[in-house]
Structures are given as C-alpha cells and as structure tokens.
C-alpha cells in the first residue's frame, strides 16, 4: 500500500492556556522508521515530538503508538501559549542502517493559531 501521511486539518484555532490535538494518520508503517512532528520547514524547523518514549513537557501522543498496527500519530499540546503558533508537520522517516534516517513523506501541515484568552 502506498504510504500517505494525512493531516486532515489545514488549521486549528486554540485559546491560550487550552489544549489542542494535531491529527496525523498513516496508510502504512512501511518502510520501517520513525515518525516525527516538526514546527516549520527547512533547516530552521523545530523538532516537537518523536514518539521515542522520551518525556516532552505539554505534549502527549493521543493513541498508543506501541500497538502493532497503530496508524495514528496524533499529538495533544497542552497549555498552549502564543509561542506555540506556527505550522506543524507530521513527517515519516525511513530508518538508516549506518547513515541518518531519510525523510520520505510528510503531511500537508496544520497551522496552529493561538487566540488571546
């Protein structure tokens, strides 16, 4: 099955202090490799979450990504602040053996717009 990364929402509005969910689903888990969330594009983009089990303040995965056939890599950002505004991309990588992981597909991006409370 062809790999497709889908972020169904182009944009979400969230009041400062509230939580928001950024949705991301895959059509396939192959090739083997991680899924990572970034804010922004290009060399200056910021890694937000990588489903690697490490603790990231205010960010949680929505579903159990350790389950065998899980295709849902959505995240919840809590206590949103104006600094969280930007475009978030869900990106699938192919695992490298000795070389770095290769970026192979991305969702179309979800714009997070933070409203004053």
């Amino acid at each position: 099955k062809e790999l497709k990364v889908t972020q169904p929402e182009k944009s979400v509005s969230v009041a400062a202090g509230d939580s928001t969910v950024l949705n991301c689903t895959l059509t396939s888990l192959l090739p083997v490799g991680p899924i990572r969330w970034y804010r922004g594009v290009g060399p200056s983009r910021l890694l937000i979450y990588s489903f690697a089990g490490e603790y990231v303040p205010r960010i949680r995965n929505v579903s159990d990504t350790t389950k065998r056939n899980n295709m849902d890599f959505s995240i919840r950002i809590s206590n949103v602040t104006p600094a969280d505004a930007g475009i978030y991309y869900c990106v699938k990588f192919q695992k490298g053996s000795s070389e770095p992981d290769t970026e192979i597909q991305s969702g179309g991006g979800t714009e997070v717009y933070v409203l004053a409370k």
Partner: antibody, heavy 119, light 108 residues
C-alpha cells in the same frame, strides 16, 4: 455551480483606499478558506492574503502587511479586501480564490477586478 | 519562503506535439504542488493538484509528475485550446503560498 464575482476595483491615486468585494455562491462559504491573489499587468500570480472559514485566522504577504485587511461576512457569503495606503506597485487584477477543503491550493477563481493606482 | 522556478519561460510548439514544462522548488515540497492554466483575459484554472492528480474535467492529455523539488507538467498532444500560460504553485511551506513565474506555451 461555484461562482465567485469580484467588484470594487477602479482607478485611485497613491495613498488612497479601496475596498474589494467577492460574492460567493454554489458552495458552503462559511466552511471554506478564501484568498486574494493578484496579477500585475503582464506579470505572474502573487498570493496576497488568506482568511479561514470562521474568519479567525488571517495571513498576508509581506508586500501588503499593515496596509491590507482581509475579512468576510458569512451571513452574506461575501469576502472583502480593504486596501489602504495604495501604491503604484499594487496595480493589478485582484482575484478571489476558493481553497480546496483539505489543502491550500485553489480550486475555483473569480474573474477578477482591476485596481489601478496612478497619479 | 519556497521559491519556484519554471522553465522554459516560453515554449514554441505546433499542435499535436508534446509539451514538457518544468517547475523546480528551492526546497522539498513533497507532492504539495498544483498546476494552473491561464488564457488571456481569463482567471487561472486548476489543472493538477498533489503533483499528479488531475482536477475534475481536465482531459487526460495533461499529466503531472515529480516530488520533492522537481516537477513536470506534460501535455501529450497539444490542442489549439492548450496554448496558454502555465503556473505551478506550492502549498507545503506557507505562508506565503508561492507561484512559479509561469511558462508560456505558444504556437510555433
């Protein structure tokens, strides 16, 4: 059938203001993100501004930021572009464009309205 | 900002010939690329989205390909109504949404 009809263009002097309108029909206007795209005479396309379906989210090209304001009235199915402090380089045909529901490309365009800024 | 560069600027061909138009992005936009056709005095019309998906009502002589930074629009056999200006647009890196400078397909 989707229809977008722009109006409000005309000839103005530098520094003056103009308000463009775009009347929409044939789709659920309030759930569609809308854009203005312009085209200077004999030139290519330049994205100007975007507004989300609810009107909460707006974005502008750097070239118009602080001078242009995009807005919408979902009860009237109408999109607006308030253009202040107009410059000669704003002379262009202004198109109203409907975005695809899931991605930011334009599936429908209006016929455009010509704005000429000249002293 | 992602810059799109279209080439050639002008393509002079005869009806029935194959047209190959190129669009290059300054950084990867994956497959988040659209193509539009514009005839004189008319607004642009969507031809292709997601790099290769034809919009509703677009004849199958139009096809798109590519991903990442290199994209191609191919018109397999030019018809008289295909002579126009063609623009690519990326919708991955935004705002701003950016367009290429256009390729004019003219009758030789």
């Amino acid at each position: 059938d989707v229809q977008l009809v722009e109006s409000g263009g005309g000839v103005v002097r530098p520094g003056e203001s103009l308000r463009l309108s775009c009347a929409a029909s044939g789709f659920t206007f309030s759930s569609s993100d809308m854009n203005w795209v312009r085209q200077a005479p004999g030139e290519g396309l330049e994205w100007v501004s975007l507004i989300s379906g609810s009107g909460e989210i707006t974005y502008y090209a750097d070239s118009v930021k602080g001078r242009f304001t995009i807005s919408r009235d979902n009860s009237k199915n109408t999109l607006y572009l308030q253009m202040n402090s107009l410059r000669a380089e704003d002379t262009a045909i202004y198109y109203c464009a409907k975005e695809n529901n899931m991605y930011r490309f334009f599936d429908y365009w209006g016929l455009g309205t010509l704005v000429t800024v000249s002293s | 900002e992602t810059v799109l560069t279209q080439s050639p600027g002008t393509l002079s061909l005869s009806p029935g010939e194959r047209a190959t138009l190129s669009c290059r992005a300054s950084q990867s936009v994956y497959t988040y690329l659209a193509w539009y056709q514009q005839k004189p005095g008319q607004p642009p019309r969507l031809l292709i989205h997601a790099a290769r998906n034809r919009a509703a009502g677009i004849p199958d002589r139009f096809s798109g390909s590519g991903s990442g930074t290199e994209f191609t629009l191919t018109i397999s056999s030019l018809q008289s109504e295909d002579f126009a200006v063609y623009y690519c647009q990326q919708y991955y890196d935004r705002p701003p949404l950016t367009f290429g400078g256009g390729t004019k397909v003219e009758i030789k």
